[in-house]
């Protein structure tokens, strides 16, 4: 990548990107550009949209000049009877621009959802659907009683009118968050993921957390009482420290784990919460990772096969997460 030249941006102001298109730094970290979308040509200077799981596929290693924005392997989405590839954007109606990301669809409104506050020149604003127009528009009604203007003007909320608090921008956002996926490992440290647009700019992003359904070294079957077939949530005698890539959790945790059954059922997390865990590494570095903590487990026959790509929906999803 040739970033030796001095940074020179086409315009000093950040460009205005179409709905659903991310504003990103170019590959040299110089200029903010509108990210290229699925199937579009890309270069090191014109990167693909990372928020949609896209990467610039240059084909042969020899060619590092121009590529095509390609989706990292991710689950497709079925929406309104159509199938969309992960990373693909589409307009679900004239009002919404949607994106598929790893099986989940997130949409941003194309119509302004701005709050029109009462003002002296428009004391009674009202949204109406105009013929031939997709989006509703504001109209101003004349007050029947001129004395009503005063109280109407007092109705504004400070946060709505004074600044760019992104949580107010989110009024334009259809917040969607998938359930956490099942832990990637049935024992030991694994990863659980979800897709959400519950963030500052309503962008679809993939979140991950560490998870441990049960320790691998625990022989839980011998704890099953006579006459019982399952141990749903075995008691772990002592607090544990978690290990991750040679790093150890700073604190000890009296964590709950899921048990096992002897009748072919499997026990998986049912209600969970997500908490930050600090890990200290041998070189002294401290890293903070979100981790799943189990509240309750459920034992059931919906067990995933080792190579079953159509894992049961029950198993794939984590219900009742508190965070």
């Amino acid at each position: 990548q040739d970033c030796s030249a001095q940074c020179q941006c086409a315009a000093e102001a950040a460009p205005h990107c179409p709905a659903g298109v991310s504003l990103v730094l170019d590959g040299c970290g110089c200029c903010r550009v509108c990210a290229k979308q699925l199937g579009e040509l890309c270069t090191e200077r014109d990167p693909c949209d990372p928020h949609k799981g896209l990467f610039c596929d240059f084909g042969s290693p020899a060619n590092r000049k121009i590529g095509v924005c390609t989706a990292k392997d991710g689950a497709p989405c079925v929406f309104g009877g159509s199938v969309y590839r992960s990373g693909e954007s589409f307009q679900s109606s004239c009002k919404y621009q949607c994106t598929c990301l790893d099986g989940a669809v997130g949409c941003v409104p194309l119509c302004s959802m701005d709050v029109r506050l009462p003002s002296p020149d428009c004391p009674f604003p009202r949204r109406v659907k105009l013929p031939g127009k997709c989006c509703e528009e504001w109209v101003c009604d004349e007050p029947k009683d001129r004395t009503a203007v005063g109280p109407a003007l007092a109705a504004y909320r400070l946060e709505d009118t004074f600044g760019p608090d992104p949580t107010m921008m989110r009024a334009n956002c259809l917040v969607q968050t998938t359930e956490w996926s099942a832990c990637s490992k049935t024992c030991g440290m694994g990863i659980s993921t979800r897709v959400t647009n519950d963030n500052t700019f309503c962008r679809l992003e993939k979140q991950s957390r560490l998870c441990m359904v049960r320790p691998c070294e625990a022989d839980l079957e011998e704890n099953i009482k006579k006459g019982k077939k399952c141990i749903r949530t075995p008691k772990i005698a002592k607090p544990v420290k978690f290990e991750l890539s040679g790093c150890t959790s700073v604190k000890t945790y009296r964590a709950k784990f899921c048990g096992v059954c002897t009748d072919g059922r499997c026990c998986t997390p049912h209600r969970t919460t997500t908490l930050p865990v600090e890990f200290k590494c041998p070189d002294g570095e401290i890293m903070k990772k979100n981790m799943m903590f189990i509240k309750t487990c459920a034992c059931h026959y919906n067990c995933p096969g080792d190579n079953d790509i159509f894992e049961s929906l029950y198993y794939r999803k984590m219900y009742g997460d508190m965070a």
């Epitope: 950040a14 400070l158 946060e159 004074f162 600044g163 760019p164 992104p166 949580t167 963030n199």
Partner: antibody, heavy 114, light 110 residues
Framework: EVTLKESGPVLVKPTETLTLTCTVS????????VHWIRQPPGKGLEWLGV???????DYNAAFMSRLTISKDTSKSQVVFTMTNMDPVDTATYYC????????WGQGTTVTVSS | ESVVTQPPSVSGAPGQRVTISCRSS?????????ANWVQQLPGTAFKGLIG???NRAPGVPDRFSGSKSGTSASLAITGLQAEDEADYYC?????????FGGGTKLTVLG
Amino acid sequence: EVTLKESGPVLVKPTETLTLTCTVSGFSLSTFGVHWIRQPPGKGLEWLGVIWRRGGTDYNAAFMSRLTISKDTSKSQVVFTMTNMDPVDTATYYCARDGGFDYWGQGTTVTVSS
Amino acid sequence: ESVVTQPPSVSGAPGQRVTISCRSSIGAVTTSNYANWVQQLPGTAFKGLIGGTSNRAPGVPDRFSGSKSGTSASLAITGLQAEDEADYYCALWYSTHYVFGGGTKLTVLG
């Protein structure tokens, strides 16, 4: 009555970390964000960063690698941390409420010197 | 990098109208810049006057008003009073950060 009050050390050595606390009253940190601004002696204002009411943060790019802003809503406190302080960071540091910067703290003067 | 420019000083006689400009170096000032105006009275703390281009903060008299046009935002003060003598700062929001202007000293003559 809305008030904001900055507290923290008045003297910091070069390379040390500055930690300031903004304690607010008369409003909730879950309703309003809080900005940090500084004013070097005899100069104008410089915006440093903000923690929004929902906990998100935005920082001045020039200080991104050195700045952390966090909050404890239950204690009505916002904590501002700036690492690797330098004599050029000598200034009066203010916290101000989001919403037109309508209310400000009285400021705390921080001197960076060995 | 965005630069916000204000005149170093303006002056006016009591009762007059003065305006202070706030120019953005990177093009038109829009409602998305949420132009803010802040007052610093001599020897006292700061106080917000205007937010979101033209919205007065609670308790601010209607002699103070904010507007925008082209590449500038403006603060207008009508019926100038001796107690308006202060430093005035504007701040513009650029997608991820605010930038303050250099400040304008307002002198009330007489």
